[in-house]
């Protein structure tokens, strides 16, 4: 089941899923002056069986001038060096993607994509927050958001992390004041709704990382 | 109480376009995508796409790709759609729909006739 | 796209009568959601996530099923379930509905 709202903003982080729930949709987005192919894939989707999830269909850019060119989906060598570097470190990966069993990797990139990825995830789905370059984690708990389903409706917890700024004199864990969930859903609305917000990864917090080359949106 | 509240029902002419708004109230108009539902006169239900008012982000159905833009005044907690060309077959009530998992609240529906 | 193809078309029953609505999907999805449209109306949520009554939804209305076959039932039809029924998917863009049951008067 489709989230139908976006992981919960934490100011001066970024989050990144480390693997992808099967049903998982990326857009087949490409850069300007490049197109889908006709009769192309409009998304990837996260498929698969009990023992192996890949990505269906492939995502193919041409040029928006040329009708009969069809761009390679196979990254050169450059191109998949440079979109590894944007990726979240090693250390702050929980788990091998790997060895998650109904999750797919990041697909690698095809050639004239688009400079960010739009994905849909799933009911299931889990991201990591870490705190942009130059703060500091503070956490009282997890620094992941699920998303859930409650009463039919989606909702993503909230992760336990507050970013610092290093120069900033910080408080201690226990003594933060809470974090709330901006742009929250009012509980009171109906009994069966829990706090949520409706956010879309920050491409202003994603562009204050040095290694930043692409950024990611989750839809 | 959530309501979401539709403009009424248009005449057009074939080739123009229309606008439909939808004003939503009783609750966070940022923090849900607002969808939108086409169904012609004695048809079925079809998606048409969703905006997410906070940033302005659409996804379509690719059938309603050229045909519908949807759009969000945060300032005023509406949401528009406007279908561009339009042509006789357009002729339907479009509804929109709060999302956020199930369709739970749904505007009256805004009636659209495209006639020479 | 999942095509959602519900059966039948239309049903005519009575009052009373035990009414069963199936749908089925192109691809296996993870829930069904049933909406009921009366005449002139927008259409109103009745089950989610496959058997979860919406609030306000009499105990007569059921739904089941997993995979690609669900099934709507109503144990005994009252004369306010008189209407058209939508299943719908919501595991995979685009989003897509079945294309409706009547339910109509024998």
């Known amino acids: 089941e489709l989230c139908d709202d976006d992981p919960p903003e934490i100011p001066h982080a970024t989050f990144k899923a480390m693997a992808y729930k099967e049903g998982t949709m990326l857009n087949c987005e490409c850069k300007r002056g490049f197109r889908r192919i006709k009769s192309g894939s409009l998304y990837m989707l996260c498929t698969g069986n009990s023992s192996h999830s890949s990505w269906d269909n492939q995502c193919q850019c041409t040029s928006s001038a040329t009708r009969n060119t069809t761009k390679q989906v196979t990254p050169q060598p450059e191109e998949q060096k440079e979109r590894k570097t944007t990726e979240m470190q090693s250390p702050m990966q929980p788990v091998d993607q790997a060895s998650l069993p109904g999750h797919c990797r990041e697909p690698p990139p095809w050639e004239n994509e688009a400079t960010e990825r739009i994905y849909h995830f799933v009911v299931g789905q889990m991201v990591y927050y870490q705190c942009v370059q130059g703060y500091r984690a503070l956490h009282r708990g997890p620094a992941e958001s699920v998303c859930k389903m409650t009463h039919g409706k989606t909702r993503w917890t909230q992760p336990q992390l507050i970013c610092t700024g290093e120069m900033e004199t910080s408080q201690f864990p226990g003594e933060e004041k809470p974090q709330a969930s901006p742009e929250g859903r009012p509980e009171s609305e109906t009994s069966c709704l829990v706090t949520t917000t409706d956010f879309q990864i920050q491409t202003e917090m994603a562009a204050t990382m040095e290694t930043s080359i692409f950024t990611t949106e989750y839809q | 109480q959530v309501q979401l509240v539709q403009s009424g029902a248009e005449v057009k002419k074939p080739g123009s376009s229309v606008k439909v708004s939808c004003k939503a109230s009783?609750?966070?108009?940022?923090?849900?995508?607002m969808h939108w539902v086409r169904q012609a006169p004695g048809q079925g239900l079809e998606w048409i796409g969703y905006?997410?008012?906070?940033?302005?982000?659409?996804e379509y159905n690719q059938k309603f790709k050229d045909k519908a833009t949807i759009t969000a005044d945060e300032s005023t907690n509406t949401a528009y759609m406007e279908l561009s060309s339009l042509r006789s077959e357009d002729t339907a009530v479009y509804y929109c729909?709060?999302?956020?998992?199930?369709?739970?609240?749904w505007g009256q529906g805004t009636l659209v006739t495209v006639s020479s | 796209d999942i095509q959602m193809t519900q059966s039948p078309s239309t049903l005519s029953a009575s009052v009373g009568d035990r009414v069963t609505i199936t749908c089925s999907a192109s691809?296996?999805?993870?829930?069904m959601h049933w909406y009921q449209q009366k005449p002139g109306k927008a259409p109103k949520l009745l089950i989610y996530t496959t058997s979860n009554l919406a609030s306000g939804v009499p105990a007569r209305f059921s739904g089941s099923g997993s995979g690609t076959e669900f099934t709507l039932t109503i144990s005994s039809l009252q004369p306010d379930d008189f209407a058209t029924y939508y299943c719908?998917?919501?595991?995979?863009?685009?989003?897509?509905f079945g294309q409706g049951t009547k339910v109509e008067v024998k």
């Open positions: 719908h998917q919501r595991s995979t863009y685009p989003l897509t």
């Open positions: 009783g609750y966070t108009f940022t923090s849900y995508r």
């Open positions: 729909a709060r999302g956020g998992g199930v369709f739970d609240y």
């Open positions: 905006i997410r008012p906070k940033r302005g982000y659409t």
């Open positions: 691809s296996s999805i993870s829930y």
